[in-house]
Amino acid sequence: LRKVAHLTGKSNSRSMPLEWEDTYGIVLLSGVKYKKGGLVINETGLYFVYSKVYFRGQSCNNLPLSHKVYMRNSKYPQDLVMMEGKMMSYCTTGQMWARSSYLGAVFNLTSADHLYVNVSELSLVNFEESQTFFGLYKL
Amino acid sequence: LRKVAHLTGKSNSRSMPLEWEDTYGIVLLSGVKYKKGGLVINETGLYFVYSKVYFRGQSCNNLPLSHKVYMRNSKYPQDLVMMEGKMMSYCTTGQMWARSSYLGAVFNLTSADHLYVNVSELSLVNFEESQTFFGLYKL
Amino acid sequence: LRKVAHLTGKSNSRSMPLEWEDTYGIVLLSGVKYKKGGLVINETGLYFVYSKVYFRGQSCNNLPLSHKVYMRNSKYPQDLVMMEGKMMSYCTTGQMWARSSYLGAVFNLTSADHLYVNVSELSLVNFEESQTFFGLYKL
């Protein structure tokens, strides 16, 4: 079976990395495990990995925003940032604002790699399933 | 043959959902049908679906922008929004502005599903083939 | 073997098209050649092509930004722009700013096609490997 995942925003995320809805709605999870915010690879190979995060706020103060997909493996001492998006000076001070960050690319992943998504400011993320998501598939 | 589509912007259309160029230029359409703005799935399976829309205007007034990929199937009473991007407070008042929205993710689609793209303001879309497009491929 | 590439930003790029890191870090290059900024296709077929560019500056002056993926083949007289993103009026004058452009779509590529990435303002590109990249894979 095709190894694939599409997880959607989970609004009760309270800490980093982001947590994801892995059961209901337009979610997919096949041949990949989900554990504490992470997608766990169980077969080495090439994967297309993607994520979108929808940031929004009531009153713009241009707080710098970042959105990262990173990898952790117990064999390595440090997290590896695979993809990252940053935004600064993106809205008009005091106004209601909204903006998305999209990331997607191909990586060679190894069995036991754990993939996560991190954002700089959790309180500014909207978790609608169509707006904020995290996925991958094996090529 | 691989089921794949890449449709590009069609500028003389006024209707929602967006209509697409399905014949000329860098268009691809194989194993998928195009009908009145929609990509019609004829084989159930996993698909990567993507769209980019290029918004631009002469004088910024920060009209809220949205870009949605949604699915319709006669078996279901309501459209399902698969992916969505929103922008608010994205440019400096009065200035000429330009901005893109990109969406892409994996979905389990069923034969007879119809996929469409919707935007909040058609007048602000630029339909150059390299700038505004809609596509998918079966994994 | 799967035909795939993921190249990352190379900060000593001094001219257009952008040059890429093809050896170190999270780079992939298999069944595709890299030559003077370009990915060279050696087998005709369908490819998903993507690129992300991270623009940033110390003091916003809203210089128009463009990010293009284009194709060149000696059989054709002119470059073909496959995908493009443009930004105008995207930050507040005088402020430190940062913004990304993401492109990705499916194309029918021919053996000997050369794919490149072009930006409008090289001095505003940040070349971190997680932020600016260029890749493809054969479907």
Partner: antibody, heavy 119, light 111 residues
């Protein structure tokens, strides 16, 4: 700068027809609707209909079907409204306005054409 | 057709004070995304001018003393502080469906 320049004052006899013009400049004519709005003396605003210069499609307020006909000339960037079988009830100021397709707000207006129907 | 009812028909407000104009639609003009209501200002001998779009968004070049609010069927235009140049007639308009209809107008006089 977006501008809509309307034709001048019209004085016509009952039963006749008149064609009002609205020349657009400063934007891509084929990407926005042109709407027409009537304002009778000391009255409010009534939407007549819209036309989309991109493909010539149009929609009318039922109250003006048979009374108004909207057309455009893409080459000159001009919209037209023909009013037929005129009566004194048609005496009014007629505005053209640029209208965003989806949001349907009228963000730029012509200066108005005063139509007087009198014998 | 959706009927737009404005109130009051006229009002007089002192310089520097707040003017509040209401607009009620005969049925909802809102979706999950937007409220399709727009506000215009018209001075004698001039065409209307767009002030507020989609219920609460200020048109480019319009002073920040103008604001709009509301959803569903009930909407409000506020002007604060009122200035001399705000003397005009104000109209609401919906664009939820065809035909587009306008409110009857509210004439604002500055005392």
């Amino acid at each position: 700068e977006v501008q809509l320049q309307q034709s001048g004052v019209e004085l016509v006899k009952p039963g006749a027809s008149v064609k009002l013009s609205c020349k657009a400049s400063g934007y891509t004519f084929t990407r926005f609707d042109i709407s027409w709005v009537r304002q009778r003396p000391e009255q409010g605003l009534e939407w007549i209909g819209w036309i989309f210069p991109g493909d010539g499609s149009s929609q009318y307020n039922e109250n003006f079907k048979g009374k108004a006909t909207l057309t455009t000339d893409k080459s000159s960037g001009t919209a037209y409204m023909q009013l037929n079988r005129l009566t004194s009830e048609d005496s009014a100021v007629y505005f053209c306005a640029r209208s965003l397709i989806s949001t349907a707000m009228f963000d730029h207006w012509g200066q108005g054409t005063t139509l007087t129907v009198s014998s | 057709d959706i009927v737009m009812t404005q109130s009051p028909a006229s009002l007089a407000v002192s310089l520097g004070q707040r003017a509040t104009i209401s607009c009620r639609a005969s049925k909802s003009v809102s979706t999950s995304d937007f409220s399709y209501i727009h506000w215009y200002q018209q001075k004698p001998g001039q065409p209307p001018k767009l002030l507020i779009f989609l219920a609460s968004h200020l048109e480019s070049g319009v002073p920040a003393r103008f604001s709009g609010s509301g959803s569903g069927t009930d909407f409000t235009l506020n002007i604060h502080p009122v200035e001399e140049e705000d003397a005009a007639t104000y109209y609401c308009q919906h664009s939820r469906e065809l035909p587009r209809t306008f409110g009857g107008g509210t004439k604002l006089e500055i005392k």
